[in-house]
Interface confidence: low
């Protein structure tokens, strides 16, 4: 379900009625941040609020996937008057607050990026003292993780009538193009299924019928690089098995 809240122009509730934009809740996040897998990325988030000199307890939260309802990946809390936001949650220890919430900055650093981190992230701040107020970015920042191709699986499988087929699955962003090469094949894109449902960065290519013994090579390529892996097919003639 979707947790949703309202105020004005993406705000949550104010405890006072304000019309000056500088006094209203607002949150500034870029639409997108790009970084390569393995590297770190910074998700910027700054905010304004209507409580002129708030120094009470506060909590900074980042969540992934969707606003209000998505799982939290980071949370920290600062005591009254403190500029130290004590981390209470950092998923897999890879999330770290760069900004100072007391200075209206919730910017977050994400370490050791993986393709699975490619999602939308939403920052949120909660005031919990005399003022009870909070605000969350509804549109969030998209973290776009790029990655050179990596072949995650290559295999030969039996198919009907003593035939064999080959499967190659690779991941990467942009999703890589796959090509097979092998005996009597030249270069073939084969039957490419891309991307797999629920696995946005995975691409699979199938060779439906292997007609010759020998080495079959799958090559995955995108703008960041290429990767290849091979599988060998040796049929025992007169038998129904194969060695791969």
């Amino acid at each position: 379900f979707v947790r949703t809240k309202i105020d004005t122009t993406e705000n949550l509730l104010n405890t006072e009625v304000h019309s000056s934009p500088a006094q209203r809740w607002s949150m500034q996040v870029p639409p997108e941040v790009s970084a390569e897998a393995g590297d770190a990325a910074v998700l910027p988030c700054t905010f304004t609020h209507p409580h002129r000199h708030y120094d009470g307890p506060l909590t900074a939260i980042w969540r992934a996937g969707e606003p209000y309802a998505g799982p939290q990946v980071f949370r920290c809390a600062a005591a009254r008057g403190s500029e130290l936001c004590q981390t209470a949650l950092s998923l897999h220890g890879r999330f770290r607050l760069l900004g100072n919430p007391r200075r209206n900055d919730l910017s977050l650093r994400v370490e050791r990026l993986a393709l699975a981190d490619d999602r939308r992230y939403f920052c949120r701040v909660e005031f919990a003292g005399d003022v009870h107020d909070r605000y969350e970015s509804r549109h969030g920042v998209r973290l776009h993780v790029t990655a050179a191709p990596r072949i995650v699986n290559i295999s030969v499988l039996p198919s009907p009538a003593h035939a064999f087929r080959a499967l190659c699955t690779a991941e990467g962003e942009p999703p890589p193009a796959l090509a097979w090469s092998g005996p009597a094949l030249g270069n073939s894109l084969a039957a490419v299924r891309s991307p797999r449902e629920g696995h946005g960065h995975l691409v699979t290519a199938e060779l439906p019928a292997l007609t010759h013994d020998g080495r079959y090579t799958c090559t995955a390529a995108n703008s960041l690089g290429r990767s290849e892996a091979s599988v060998y097919l040796f049929r025992f003639h007169g038998a129904s098995g194969a060695s791969t």
Epitope: K5, T9, L12
Partner: antibody
Framework: EIQLQQSGAEVKKPGSSVKVSCKAS????????MHWVKQAPGHGLEWIGT????????AYNQKFKGKATLTADRSTSTAYMELSSLTSEDTAVYYC????????????????WGQGTLVTVSS | DIVMTQSPLSLPVTPGEPASISCRST???????????LYWYLQKPGQSPQLLIY???NLASGVPDRFSGSGSGTDFTLKISRVEAEDVGVYYC?????????FGGGTKVEIK
Amino acid sequence: EIQLQQSGAEVKKPGSSVKVSCKASGYTFTDYDMHWVKQAPGHGLEWIGTIDPETGGTAYNQKFKGKATLTADRSTSTAYMELSSLTSEDTAVYYCTSFYYTYSNYDVGFAYWGQGTLVTVSS
Amino acid sequence: DIVMTQSPLSLPVTPGEPASISCRSTKSLLHSNGNTYLYWYLQKPGQSPQLLIYRMSNLASGVPDRFSGSGSGTDFTLKISRVEAEDVGVYYCMQHLEYPFTFGGGTKVEIK
């Protein structure tokens, strides 16, 4: 099905108070802020204020500050509006309405309304 | 406060004919995020208001596509391409750019 069921009509004496209720069903009560709107006889719509049922945080139209008090009871999924120091000017139909959002269509508007509660102030 | 002004006050219509209602705000309702925070509601006789259009031009769920909303930052129009008998009632515009939310005075649509 989302429904907002308001309490029945009230006749009150000048100077007294009235508390109108709005019971929400068909959705998670704390998901959407509850707003209150006034419609005096033969008149248009006037926004009174709003409450976040999750925290009790409120925002009011300055005109209704001190007149209306908004509260919410999460255990019964019910929002309340209390009007104090009633005068004939407070005679009106009062509506509760939830401001609805979806993830794909962020702000959809006052999509769900109660049936209205007529408050008559008369000596 | 943002003042919303509607015209006309009353609109006699013929079924099957088009109709148009105007709404003007004293401040631009176009936010820097690209959204225009103008909403249209219809209150049929004896009923609660119902949402027709959200964010200036988006048709609310279940609303017939003969209704459409358009406009700029301060001038808005609700159009009914072919009025039907069931469309009678009072139409209100509302701004949700900033507190307090404010409604227009309403336009009463009635069959000639």
